[in-house]
């Protein structure tokens, strides 16, 4: 019987540790996409509606803030699209990029952790264009560090929650 109790307690301990594991999945706020044709920071994301969720991490001022030291898997998916009903592209040669950036407040510094994208020729003869970028990687993050997303040509972002999102989840502690 003691073994049973111990086993249940271990399960409970494991489960509560898992539940405390930080994670975030943030989806683009389509009502507040910035304008610009060069690299801009995306600061408006949902964290509590639709597919978006956050636990033991903080979302503030457009940045995902780490609350616990650890090794995290970071990911971002950015979709760009253009349909002729919205008008014409002023230029057919485009650089469509995403940058995942880490900012440290304690030692003021900023580093690009991941980038992805391509140059594209979106011909005016086509009715619809689409391009998707997915980046992901494993990083050591410290409490207080902030993760942010920058993109080129934000006016071409696909505003759907299944198209433009980013997130993180803790995989293990720092030994």
């Amino acid at each position: 019987e003691k073994a049973m109790v111990d086993g249940s307690w271990l399960d409970l301990a494991k489960r509560s540790k898992l539940e405390a594991q930080p994670f975030a999945h943030l989806t683009i706020n389509a009502t507040d996409i910035p304008s610009g044709s060069h690299k801009v920071s995306l600061s408006s994301w949902y964290h509590d509606r639709g597919w978006a969720k956050i636990s033991n991490m903080t979302f503030s001022n457009g940045k995902l803030i780490v609350n616990q030291d650890g090794f995290y898997y970071l990911y971002a998916n950015i979709c760009f699209r253009h349909h002729e009903t919205s008008g014409d592209l002023a230029t057919e040669y485009l650089q469509l990029m995403v940058y995942v950036t880490k900012t440290s407040i304690k030692i003021p510094s900023s580093h690009t952790l991941m980038k992805g994208g391509s140059t594209k020729y979106w011909s005016g003869n086509s009715e619809f264009h689409f391009y998707s970028i997915n980046v992901g990687g494993f990083f050591k993050l410290r409490s207080g560090e902030e993760i942010s997303i920058e993109v080129s040509n934000p006016s071409l972002l696909d505003p759907d929650q299944d198209a433009t999102y980013f997130g993180a989840f803790k995989v293990r502690d720092i030994d």
Epitope: G36, S37, E84, T85, S86, G87, L89, A90, N153
Partner: antibody, heavy 126, light 103 residues
Framework: QVQLVQSGAEVRKPGASVKVSCKAS????????IHWVRQAPGQRLEWMGW????????KFSQKFQGRITVTRDTAASTAYMELRSLRSEDTAVYYC???????????????????WGQGTLVTVSS | EIVMTQSPSSLSASVGDRVTITCRAS??????LNWYQLKPGKAPRLLIY???SLQSGVPSRFSGSGSGAEFTLTISSLQPEDIATYYC?????FGQGTKVEIK
């Protein structure tokens, strides 16, 4: 304030060419596109083409392809539309219009014509 | 190619009347629809863009609504200076116009 001032009325014979100018003032000319739209007597407005004043990129209606040239002089903040091989059905009032989309803020030419020139009457008659 | 169809082609109303003009697109155009006012010998004027956004400087008696393929321009209280021809427009396509006159 934003103003588009067009050149004066023109009379041409069939087969000739005409070049209409559109001088912009009151805004940064290079940051916007200029469209050309015409209206023949008793007809609806008809879009002809646009020029991105910043990079000189152009797009034209299939109907005018091969007959139309649109250029710009950024130093003079002026756009030009030349129509060749004129026929009597080209008799119309020709307008230039600014696209509302600022090219610094995005790269979509949205076809919202927020400011227009006063129009230039081109008469094609033998 | 998208075709824009306006109705009616002309209308006559009294000062103070509520006037409604309809514009239909041959396929869905979301909310990418603009309205212009044209008076003889004057530069056209943008009234409404994006189906319902009032252009700066345009009197609030003008309003726009609709999405998809059906749109309306409403003048809540017709004024003598509103005598003009009104055009709807989606990108490269214009409606045939609606001439508004005073009774």
């Amino acid at each position: 304030q934003v103003q588009l001032v067009q050149s004066g009325a023109e009379v041409r014979k069939p087969g000739a060419s005409v070049k209409v100018s559109c001088k912009a003032s009151g805004y940064d000319f290079s940051n916007y596109a200029i469209h050309w739209v015409r209206q023949a007597p008793g007809q609806r407005l008809e879009w002809m083409g646009w020029i991105n004043a910043g990079n000189g990129n152009t797009k034209f209606s299939q109907k005018f392809q091969g007959r139309i040239t649109v250029t710009r002089d950024t130093a003079a903040s002026t756009a030009y539309m030349e129509l060749r091989s004129l026929r009597s059905e080209d008799t119309a009032v020709y307008y230039c219009a600014r696209d509302q989309s600022n090219m610094v803020r995005g790269i979509i030419i949205a076809y919202y014509f927020d400011y227009w020139g006063q129009g230039t009457l081109v008469t094609v008659s033998s | 190619e998208i075709v824009m169809t306006q109705s009616p082609s002309s209308l006559s109303a009294s000062v103070g009347d509520r006037v409604t003009i309809t514009c239909r697109a041959s396929q869905s155009i979301s909310r990418y629809l603009n309205w212009y006012q044209l008076k003889p010998g004057k530069a056209p004027r943008l009234l409404i863009y994006g189906a319902s956004s009032l252009q700066s400087g345009v009197p609030s008696r003008f309003s726009g609504s609709g999405s998809g393929a059906e749109f309306t321009l409403t003048i809540s209280s017709l004024q003598p200076e509103d005598i003009a021809t009104y055009y709807c427009q989606h990108t490269r396509a214009f409606g045939q116009g609606t001439k508004v006159e005073i009774k």
